[in-house]
């Protein structure tokens, strides 16, 4: 679970653990549950009162190379008449995920874990009203 | 794996794809430090499809703690503050990558794992099935 900082890596660990040089960790990037499919309700991005679009970002030095980002279509929310109601706000919902970054330094290659913030979808919220004195 | 552009001056022996196993620096880089993430919010309470958060703990996973959303209602909150069952609160789910200790309990050996998490909820128009 937890990842120690570089150095001070003495462990009385089980013999079955692979040897790892100090300051790094062994990472198998063959993904467990690779073929798992999201069983999200159908077309919720279009049926939501705070609808969103998807954009695929692609980076060849990142694993996985494709990361999908959502963007809210409107500032307001869609009412029962299908019109935008600007008394309510469409806001993004975000989640962190891990990716592996490949870095080139001269002819040598190193790998770095990276936290990436993904916008997953949008929700409709009542706005916070700031009263001016 | 994915193809990596190679420095033309480097030897050709380098694999263009990500290898199956890599040695990774222990320090995690945070790509979000210069952004202004909106995740720090009280949307869970202000949403028309509010949700509660549950602390999902797994010591063999990194991160070991993930907060998961559960929609509070089947319907959505209307302008009067009541639950409107003509609309549905549904979870917004996302596949994220985490690290799984492999072999189990090993401190510095991991495998990537894809998991499905519920991040929040959104209010949708229901799909109406007409019975013939």
């Amino acid at each position: 679970r937890k990842i120690p900082k570089v150095g001070h890596t003495f462990f009385q660990k089980p013999e079955s653990c692979p040897p790892v040089p100090g300051g790094s960790m062994k990472l198998d990037i063959g993904i467990i549950n690779e073929n798992q499919r999201v069983s999200m309700s159908r077309n919720i991005e279009s049926r939501s009162t705070s609808p969103w679009n998807y954009t695929v970002t692609w980076d060849p030095n990142r694993y996985p190379s494709e990361v999908v980002q959502a963007q809210c279509r409107n500032l307001g929310c869609i009412n029962a008449q299908g019109k935008e109601d600007i008394s309510m706000n469409s806001v993004p919902i975000q989640q962190e995920t891990l990716v592996v970054r490949r870095k080139h330094q001269g002819c040598s290659v190193s790998f770095q874990l990276e936290k990436v913030l993904v916008t997953v979808g949008c929700t409709c919220v009542t706005p916070v009203i700031h009263h001016v004195q | 794996g994915i193809t990596i552009p190679r420095n033309p001056g480097c030897p050709n022996s380098e694999d263009k794809n990500f290898p199956r196993t890599v040695m990774v620096n222990l320090n995690i880089h945070n790509r979000n430090t210069n952004t202004n993430p909106k995740r720090s919010s009280d949307y869970y309470n202000r949403s028309t499809s509010p949700w509660n958060l549950h602390r999902n703990e797994d010591p063999e996973r990194y991160p070991s703690v993930i907060w998961e959303a559960k929609c509070r209602h089947l319907g959505c909150i209307n302008a009067d503050g009541n639950v409107d069952y003509h609309m549905n609160s549904v979870p917004i789910q996302q596949e994220i990558l985490v690290l799984r200790r492999e072999p189990p309990h090993c401190p510095n050996s991991f495998r990537l794992e894809k998991i499905l998490v519920s991040v929040g909820c959104t209010c949708v128009t229901p799909i109406v099935h007409h019975v013939a």
Epitope: R1, K2, I3, P4, H8, T9, F10, F11, K115 | I28, R39, S40, S41, D42, Y44, N45, N52, L53, H54, R55, E57, P59, Y62, P63, S64, V65, W67, R101, H105, P107
Partner: antibody, heavy 119, light 107 residues
């Protein structure tokens, strides 16, 4: 630098409630979990529960579920713990502590709030 | 709940001594153990995290080791300012639990 400033000592009557505060300084309040820990000579250090100010989520030690309520106010970067139906057993020093969810350890602690429940 | 059994409860030391404190978990907690120092009237201060990693600014006379259920904390060449209570703590699974503490006292 990072600091967790806790409210001052409290002397309260049995049956009453008290709300302890912990103000975060020197970092983004919503990025880390806040945990609360009780210390007494008899039971030592006991983990009470956690709140994530970023998403409002809470989790409790079953032993404190009916005793403590954790809240957070982002506008003032302050975490609160309300203790209800107080008895002499609730006397002790209460600490707030910051937990790094990714790295997985408690790094900074508040100075503690001494609570005395006595008639 | 995971029980952390810490021994000894008291240690009589002289400056320059090497002292060792042990902590035994009632079930495996992998490397998820921290060690804290607490002086009278102060809050606990993190010394070691993940069983063996010194926290920023902690002198290298403080070391930790262990894995699974058995953990050891050592102070090499005890100094006067090290007289305090030391606690182990597991954050492998909640409710997070602490050892009973070891008080270092002057001989």
């Amino acid at each position: 630098q990072v600091q967790l400033q806790q409210s001052g000592a409290e002397l309260v009557r049995p049956g009453a409630s008290v709300k302890l505060s912990c103000k975060a300084l020197g970092y983004t309040f919503t990025d880390y979990e806040f945990h609360w820990v009780k210390q007494t000579p008899v039971h030592g250090l006991e983990w009470i529960g956690v709140i994530h100010p970023g998403n409002g989520g809470t989790a409790y030690n079953q032993n404190f579920r009916d005793k403590a309520t954790l809240t957070a106010d982002k506008s003032s970067s302050t975490a609160y713990m309300e203790l209800s139906s107080l008895t002499s057993e609730d006397s002790g020093v209460y600490y707030c502590t910051r937990f790094l969810t990714y790295e997985g350890y408690f790094d900074y602690w508040g100075q503690g709030t001494a609570l005395t429940v006595s008639s | 709940n995971i029980v952390m059994t810490q021994t000894p409860k008291f240690l009589l030391v002289s400056p320059g001594d090497r002292v060792t404190i042990t902590c035994k978990a009632s079930q495996s907690v992998s490397i998820d153990v921290g060690w804290f120092q607490q002086k009278p009237g102060q809050s606990p201060k993190l010394l070691i995290y993940h069983a063996s990693n010194r926290y920023t600014g902690v002198p290298d006379r403080f070391t930790g080791s262990g894995y699974g259920t058995d953990f050891t904390f050592t102070v090499n060449t005890v100094q006067a300012e090290d007289l305090a209570v030391y606690f182990c703590q597991q954050d492998y699974s909640s409710p997070y639990t602490f050892g009973g503490g070891t008080k270092l006292e002057l001989k």
